[in-house]
């Protein structure tokens, strides 16, 4: 560690006195200290002396001395008061920036350690500090106010008691800054915009920090915006603003608008687009695929969405048939919107019995006119199943009635004993048929079909089955015959709750 | 060896704020004073003004009403901020170590900043 | 504040030759506080001299400094090709501190 002479903490002169101090280390070695005038610089190897023959108050400090070449980076220093009865401090400094909740020196240094007793801190023009400033003071250094605030942002005068009177400091400005989080919050409303050619269109873009120093500025497809600025002040936080008011708009407004916010932690930028139209429109459309299948007893939600502008003035389900006259009951039918110019309907269809088959369509207005878009809405139903016996054209015929949607399928068995259903170990025969007869095949309705299995002789000890099945299940008919006519039979009793 | 870096964006609007920042390594931003400078294109080394490490500043005088320097002794750091700029702002800005005796013996290797709409 | 005046504004010289700079300060500057620069095209300054006459770390023994008051001089005793740049001359004792205009020192 560099030693220095004279070896004494702090050293009293009166200005005009000479100074020398000097200092020794193993290595070369350097003095800091404050910005002072009419020093001379000495260096010769491993000393180095600083020296004046006309101290002024202006030399009050602490000088130190350190050693570059040491690994530790050791230091000495000795502090400096020149006692000018006229100059009762030696301020470094105009300005002193802080970030809140810092320390802030303020450095006036004390030129004669004796006037200690008697120092305050004051702001300029003789006003007091502001309640709840919490200062110290050290004369080698300053005052220091403790966990400055950004209200103490004001210019400060020290003062020190001389002979009766205060004199002052020249005044040091205080600078508090706000520690920013990041760059400025953003906002740009709307979000999105549509004008029809000829009306008038309002963007706003504001940006808000903690600290006054950022900027903002909105601009339309990369070209910076004019825009006289609004300043406030409210919550604890600057507010700048920035409104673009068109009073007709035309098709060179449209495009993309961006507002920017920076400052030292950043830049932020949210965008909107602006659409200029001919005229008014209403779109309607669905994710749905317009035609929809459903189980009977299931459930079902109809979505549409639409885009207008201007805003919808009606809109409305409606049941179109063909089964009933019932209209969709309002409290099934459900909007949201998904923003200024988009939404979305829902119309849910719980629990769907036989007669709420069929279209259903949903309408809007807007200035633009009506739309409508369709659904159709057809139900699903597992076959039901009949067999009789009868003569066709002389001929002894079982004829399978199956009614179901989508169209069922038809399955004749033959199998021994008697039974209400066929099993694999029974079968003797199996008829596929490929194309039954279509009886009837109405929109929303089942599909009713008939197959005919011409038998020459009813075996008696045996089982006729027609089994029938589609995409949502299968039904069967098991037709026994006995000795004083045919016996036919149903499978268990098919319960249905719609 | 003591390093100076600055950095900040090269282009500037006018009208609008300068920031740059001047990270230091190599030695204790608590120790020295630090100064910021600039050079416009062809011409001289213009002093902007110094900071000691607990936040006492110095400044040009014929800068002083737009400047802010500020010190960040966790990161080590120190900035500048030099607001309302105009095309007469465009120079390359150094950062150096200013010390009493010795003059400014580290320098950054400098940042061009271009003030233009 | 205190200006400083270089002289001459360009010197055009041959490699090997001696070099004689002068700064000129429109008041006292005491020597501790003057200091010379040298810069590079495309590089930041480098501090040659400090207190009028001190060499910095690393600078060769052919540059020397001298002076006080009202006028200084940097003086490169046999220029090396590496020794054309600009050059300034710096006060650093009092607020604001102070550059002079530059001198060129070129190749002839």
């Known amino acids: 560690i560099p030693v220095i002479e004279p070896s004494v903490p702090e050293l009293v002169v009166k200005p005009g006195a000479t100074v020398t101090l000097r200092c020794v280390g193993n290595g070369s070695v350097e003095w800091d200290g404050p910005p002072s005038p009419h020093w001379t610089l000495y260096s010769d190897g491993s000393s180095s002396i600083l020296s004046t023959n006309n101290a002024t108050f202006q030399n009050t400090g602490t000088y130190r001395c350190t050693e570059p070449g040491d690994p530790l980076g050791g230091s000495a220093a000795i502090h400096l008061y020149v006692k000018d009865p006229a100059r009762p401090w030696n301020v470094l400094a105009q300005e002193v920036v802080v970030f809140e909740d810092q320390d802030a020196l303020l450095p006036c240094l004390l030129t004669d350690p004796v006037l200690e007793a008697g120092v305050s801190l004051v702001r300029v023009r003789g006003r007091p500090l502001m309640r709840h400033t919490n200062y110290s003071f050290s004369p080698w250094h300053g005052f220091t106010i403790h966990r400055a605030k950004f209200i103490q942002s004001q210019d400060y005068q020290c003062s020190a008691l001389m002979g009766g009177r205060k004199v002052m400091s020249i005044s040091i400005r205080l600078k508090v800054q706000k520690v920013i989080p990041g760059p400025p919050a953003l906002t740009l409303v709307p979000a999105e915009l549509v004008r029809i050619r000829g009306e008038a269109a309002q963007i706003v873009c504001s940006a808000s920090s903690v600290d006054v120093n950022f900027d903002v500025f909105l601009q339309h497809n990369n070209t910076k915006l004019a825009i006289p600025q609004q300043s406030d002040f409210h919550n604890n936080r600057y507010q700048k603003v920035l409104t673009l008011n068109l009073d007709q708009v035309d098709f060179q407004h449209a495009g993309n608008y961006s507002c920017v916010a920076s400052n030292v932690q950043g830049k932020h930028s949210t965008s909107m687009f602006f659409r200029v139209v001919e005229s008014a429109y209403l779109n309607l459309s669905s994710e749905q695929n317009l035609i929809q299948e459903v189980t009977v007893g299931e459930g079902l939600n109809l979505k549409v969405m639409v885009e207008a502008y201007p805003g919808l003035q009606g809109f409305n389900w409606t049941y179109l048939g063909p089964f009933s006259d019932h209209q969709p009951e309002p409290k099934l039918a459900n909007a949201t919107t998904k923003d200024t110019y988009r939404h979305t309907f829902t119309l849910s269809l719980p629990r769907l019995k036989p007669s709420e088959a069929g279209r259903y369509s949903f309408l809007a207005r807007n200035p633009g006119g009506w739309r409508a878009l369709t659904f159709e809405l057809t139900l699903r139903y597992p076959p039901e199943v009949s067999v009789i016996w009868t003569f066709i054209n002389g001929s002894g015929t079982l004829l399978c009635a199956a009614s179901g949607y989508p169209q069922p399928n038809v399955t004749w068995l033959q199998c021994s004993g008697h039974t209400d259903r066929c099993d694999e170990a029974q079968v003797l025969q199996v008829w596929d048929d490929p194309y039954p007869e279509v009886l009837s095949q109405e929109p929303f309705h089942k599909v009713t079909v008939q197959s005919l299995l011409t038998v020459e002789t009813l075996e008696h000890n045996q089982t006729y089955e027609c089994r029938a099945h589609n995409s949502v299940g299968s039904g069967s008919w098991a037709f026994i015959p006995i000795s004083a006519g045919a016996h036919t039979h149903p499978p268990d009793e098919f319960l249905f709750t719609p | 060896q003591v390093q100076l870096q600055e950095s900040g964006p090269g282009l500037v609007k006018p009208s609008e704020t300068l920031s740059l920042t001047c990270t230091v390594s190599?030695?204790?931003?608590?120790?020295?004073?630090w100064s910021w400078l600039r050079q416009p294109p062809g011409k001289g080394l213009e002093w902007i003004g110094y900071?000691?490490?607990?936040?006492?500043?110095n400044y040009n005088p014929s800068l002083k009403s737009r400047v802010t320097i500020s010190v960040d002794t966790s990161k080590n750091q120190f900035s500048l901020e030099l607001s309302s700029v105009t095309a007469a702002d465009t120079a390359v800005y150094y950062c150096?170590?200013?010390?009493?005796?010795?003059?400014?013996?580290?320098w950054g290797q400098g940042t061009t900043v271009t003030v233009s709409s | 504040e205190i200006v400083l005046t270089q002289s001459p504004g360009t010197l055009s010289l041959p490699p090997g030759e001696r070099a004689t700079l002068s700064c000129r300060a429109s008041q006292n500057v005491s020597s501790t506080y003057l200091a010379w620069y040298h810069q590079k095209p495309g590089q930041a300054p480098r501090l040659l001299i400090y207190g009028a006459s001190s060499r910095a770390t690393g600078i060769p023994d052919r540059f020397s400094g001298s002076g006080s008051g009202t006028d200084f001089t940097l003086t490169i005793s046999r220029l090396e090709p590496e020794d054309f740049a600009v050059y300034y001359c710096q006060q650093y004792g009092s607020s604001p501190r102070t550059f002079g205009q530059g001198t060129k020192v070129e190749i002839k």
């Open positions: 150096a170590r200013d010390r009493t005796f010795y003059g400014m013996d580290v």
């Open positions: 900071i000691f490490y607990s936040g006492s500043i």
């Open positions: 190599g030695a204790s931003i608590s120790t020295y004073f």
